[in-house]
Amino acid sequence: LKGQEFAPSHQQVYAPLRADGDKPRAHLTVVRQTPTQHLKNQFPALHWEHELGLAFTKNRMNYTNKFLLIPESGDYFVYSQVTFRGMTSECSEIRQAGRPNKPDSITVVITKVTDSYPEPTQLLMGTKSVCEVGSNWFQPIYLGAMFSLQEGDKLMVNVSDISLVDYTKEDKTFFGAFLL
Amino acid sequence: LKGQEFAPSHQQVYAPLRADGDKPRAHLTVVRQTPTQHLKNQFPALHWEHELGLAFTKNRMNYTNKFLLIPESGDYFVYSQVTFRGMTSECSEIRQAGRPNKPDSITVVITKVTDSYPEPTQLLMGTKSVCEVGSNWFQPIYLGAMFSLQEGDKLMVNVSDISLVDYTKEDKTFFGAFLL
Amino acid sequence: LKGQEFAPSHQQVYAPLRADGDKPRAHLTVVRQTPTQHLKNQFPALHWEHELGLAFTKNRMNYTNKFLLIPESGDYFVYSQVTFRGMTSECSEIRQAGRPNKPDSITVVITKVTDSYPEPTQLLMGTKSVCEVGSNWFQPIYLGAMFSLQEGDKLMVNVSDISLVDYTKEDKTFFGAFLL
């Protein structure tokens, strides 16, 4: 019966205690994107820095080829910010001629790829119309939420237009996940 | 060997178990800002409410003089929202005369100051161009991510223009961090 | 004294260890909203999907009648994103006639209802002016922070205009909370 005081009655046997410092975690930061081919009708995925500066992966959470690989099943908080910047958006010029138009837009999607499912699953989407008149513009889209993920799942960040992503600073565009 | 069932094999000796309720945590809320001098080329730092209303600090996480002081090393989730509000931005008037212009902007930076490092480190930045025509405008910038912090690190929130920060409500502008 | 190595000296007796997988958690996703009456001077509350797709509730965190019910006292991270979409906002037409005007706006509030306080408490607010000229527009508002909640507290998400909420995809509009 020794040590029993460390196992209060509400603690389930099937969910063993584990040290917080032992949990899979990653924070990835932006790098300059190399143009790559991507599937038609699918937004291109960003690739990331995983070691330098503020970036890290730990406790079996690995980054490889645009994907964060989930090393154990559980509930994860997943987040990303992408900062976009561009010149005057097209729609504004059309608008000036008096013709309302579906605006240009910027979109970020955090996507899950699972072996057991043929289609990628969109976990989070941030999408915004951009109709700036006569100027350079820039703005972030932030996303974050909790998901039940399985060992072997892969996460990536897709964007509507890779050429609009601000890759200049690690604090502007980033991607992370941690086991709760 | 007694008590061994409470120490599953994946648990590392160097990362002791600890009660979640014992972890450093803080949620700070906005207060009216007193104009203070700040370093040239550095955005001014906000100061915060740490006790009243929704605000709290606990478990050795202390707030003092615009800084959250990190009391123990580990991985922290750090977040802030700043709501900005202003009158018509300058650039829109210039634009109306037909001259494209670099737009006004609003920026939030969560900054880390470390004794052992001369320069502050920008952990998170949210920056947005503002070109509103003929109106009062208001909008939030939200930031949040996970960072490996060291005991003694200090965190602050800097903004591009302190006079544009909406300090009227504790739910509009806030800053927090918690050990994972 | 056996098992003592699993109880480091900084661990408080009053805060028992507990398995992370045993903690209350929920991620709710958007559904089509049915028009309902709401209190005068109070923004309408959204209702949510709690079982299908990405949505789940677990460990005694229950969803019912627009509310997430907090099953045990503690510090929770609470978050929501609402994606809004609409046609040209009214203010832009007024502006075109040369009269500056308080802009249309979109607002999200995460609200706490507690039995010990007659007024709902606004935990988080994201509010943004919308003055889009001649176009359809869409954009998200994201919120997230940590709060000390009591057993029996109820959380809901209120919005300024339920008809502007994008209910088309579970990744665009969502609401969640988890015990830290």
């Epitope: - | - | 019912t64 009648n65 019910l69 209802v113 039995d115 010990s116 007659p118 029996g152 109820k154």
Partner: antibody
């Protein structure tokens, strides 16, 4: 118009179970919390317990916990109180009240006498 | 249980007088409520959260205090204020009331 109306027998025999219903109009009980409070003759107010109607989650005064049950019927917008094994000491005016999320409001009260 | 000690148990004052009632909790509480109860009527909430005036309540009523010591004040007593006043804490289980203060006109 917002109203809380307590109803039930005015006389209950000792050792029997006291049952009262609070019928609500003008608001949805699921948007708030519902309480029962009693006031014995010439005495102060005693909180008996509360229910969170959306979930049915209850909280009771420990001094009454073994005897009190609060339930709700959301379809009828009603909350009920049951107090078992009553004695003369349970003679009181019983009030239902709401709290949380909207201004507090009380019913007008229902006098229940325990007597043989 | 958190005990609420209210004083005085009764008082008599003239119209226009300032009336003060105190309530002491046996341990610190965050939310204090003050109710008014007229004979044969249900209690009516006057003050919540220690110092917030409930909707429709005249501004002559006020509350203050924090932790364990709370005060309820009627700045200028009116004839319609004849009633019994109760404090109540919402922190612990059970929620407990003070024993009441009966206010009469001299």
């Amino acid at each position: 118009q917002v109203q809380l109306q307590e109803s039930g027998p005015g006389l209950v025999r000792p050792s029997q179970t006291l049952s009262l219903t609070c019928t609500v109009s003008g608001f949805d009980i699921q948007d708030t919390y519902m309480h029962w409070v009693r006031q014995r003759p010439g005495r102060g107010l005693e909180w008996m317990g509360r229910i969170e109607p959306a979930s049915g989650h209850t909280k009771y005064n420990p001094s009454l916990k073994s005897r009190v049950t609060i339930t709700r019927d959301t379809s009828k917008n009603q909350v009920s109180l049951r107090l078992s094994s009553v004695t003369a000491a349970d003679t009181a005016v019983y009030y239902c009240a709401r709290s949380g999320g909207m201004p507090d409001m009380w019913g007008q009260g229902s006098l229940v006498t325990v007597s043989s | 249980d958190i005990q609420m000690t209210q004083s005085p148990s009764s008082l008599s004052a003239s119209v226009g007088d300032r009336v003060t009632i105190t309530c002491r909790a046996s341990q610190g509480v965050m939310y204090m409520y003050w109710y008014q109860q007229k004979p044969g009527k249900a209690p009516k909430l006057l003050i919540y959260g220690a110092s917030n005036l409930a909707s429709g309540v005249p501004s002559r009523f006020s509350g203050s205090g924090s932790g364990t010591d709370f005060t309820f004040t009627i700045s200028s007593l009116q004839p319609e204020d004849i009633a019994t006043y109760y404090c109540q804490q919402w922190e612990g289980n059970p929620r407990t009331f003070g024993q009441g203060t009966k206010v009469e006109i001299k």
